[in-house]
């Protein structure tokens, strides 16, 4: 079957590399400086993406694989691929269309991106305030006020390891 | 391949509560918000409220407070809304829906939908 | 509470440019996002962040927004971008959507 197809299309025996050059009767040509295809068959080569600006290199091209960018200090990527940088803000702030603003009392902000977003209002859960919220920390809701009894004491969770917006990308 | 599956389809009767299921796979729960949003018959779309899957924090739209309870459990990677005393109006598809990277509000991954009918 | 307000119908024949706008007060200092929904199915992100477009959606969607007045945009219009369109908001702790537009295909 392999040996049918490859006399229908001598073009599917090129590698991931090279290309099916039209103009050479279609011998694979490896793909000229700057360009790659990263499966084979391919009848053209497709551009580089160049990381600049903002933009910095995180893989850098190969024969067979786009060039990976991220984003220079400061700056986060977002879209598919790191499509965009967006400025950092500090936490206990929020990027708005005119820069970086401070959270409003009641509401925080624990990343360097995204919204300030309102405290957690632990009594709607049916439980109670164990550690004050602030610009850049939820509060941390504990048990309802109904299991505080006296002389009872209630420990503070471990900050967590990783939240929303830290995963890898 | 990242999915967002939720539980099935329930009837309930007027007064009671229901709980919806929304099961993630594919990306790290913890990591993005989620949200629930539901849909009434041939209405339009209606935010109830937030989970932060890494403090279990949560955020819910003034109309269902004191009503609705956004939950999740890590260790299954799923996120639970359950609405009380249901009345008929509450009839409608519930989606949950995943809060995308930028952490702006933009929903870039919704469940298939779970339909609640409360009828007597 | 703030209000979005969408035309509830916008027909355009297949080839032309549809605009489907969302209005609001002093919508351009906000962020808006933007879905479709088809018939029976959840609704998908076309346009986040006033104008950017997550991978998957063609380029045939943008968007605008500044003022009063965010806009959806779709040019060369198919028969498969009939749908309901919604916009989207955040505005003082809650998440608020357009009542949606219904985009017909003629």
């Known amino acids: 079957f392999e040996r049918t197809r490859s006399l229908q299309d001598p073009c599917s025996n090129c590698p991931a590399g090279t290309f099916c050059d039209n103009n050479r009767n279609q011998i694979c040509s490896p793909c000229p400086p700057n360009s790659f295809s990263s499966a084979g068959g391919q009848r053209t080569c497709d551009i580089c993406r160049q990381c600049k600006g903002v933009f910095r290199t995180r893989k850098e091209c190969s024969s067979t694989s786009n060039a990976e960018c991220d984003c220079t200090p400061g700056f986060h990527c977002l879209g598919a691929g790191c499509s965009m940088c967006e400025q950092d803000c500090k936490q206990g702030q929020e990027l708005t269309k005119k820069g970086c603003k401070d959270c409003c009392f009641g509401t925080f902000n624990d990343q360097k991106r995204g919204i300030c977003r309102p405290w957690t209002n632990c009594s709607l859960d049916g439980k109670s305030v164990l550690v004050n919220g602030t610009k850049e920390r939820d509060v941390v809701c504990g048990p309802s006020p109904a299991d505080l009894s006296p002389g009872a004491s209630s420990v503070t969770p471990p900050a967590p390891a990783r939240e929303p917006g830290h995963s890898p990308q | 391949q990242m999915q967002l599956v939720q539980s099935g389809a329930e009837v309930k009767k007027p007064g009671a509560s229901v709980k919806v299921s929304c099961k993630a796979s594919g990306y790290s729960f913890s990591g993005y918000y989620m949200h629930w949003v539901r849909q009434a018959p041939g209405q339009g779309l209606e935010w109830m409220g937030w989970?932060?899957?890494?403090?279990?924090?949560?955020n819910y739209a003034q109309k269902f407070q004191g009503r609705v309870t956004i939950t999740r459990d890590t260790s299954a990677s799923t996120a639970y809304m359950e609405l009380s005393s249901l009345r008929s109006e509450d009839t409608a598809v519930y989606y949950c829906?995943?809060?995308?990277?930028?952490?702006?509000?933009?929903?870039?991954?919704w469940g298939q939908g779970t339909l609640v009918t409360v009828s007597s | 509470s703030y209000e979005l307000t969408q035309p509830p119908s916008v027909s355009v024949a297949p080839g032309k440019t549809a605009r489907i706008t969302c209005g609001g007060n002093?919508?351009?200092?906000?962020?808006v996002h933007w879905y479709q929904q088809k018939p029976g199915q959840a609704p998908v992100l076309v346009i986040y962040?006033?104008?950017d477009r997550p991978s998957g959606i063609p380029e045939r969607f943008s968007g605008s927004n500044s003022g009063n007045t965010a806009t959806l945009t779709i040019s060369r219009v198919e028969a498969g971008d009939e749908a309901d369109y919604y916009c989207q908001v955040w505005d003082s702790s809650s998440v608020v959507f357009g009542g949606g537009t219904q985009l017909t295909v003629l």
């Open positions: 829906a995943r809060e995308g990277m930028a952490m702006r509000l933009e929903l870039d991954k």
């Open positions: 002093n919508i351009g200092s906000k962020s």
């Open positions: 962040y006033d104008s």
């Open positions: 989970v932060n899957p890494m403090s279990g924090g949560t």
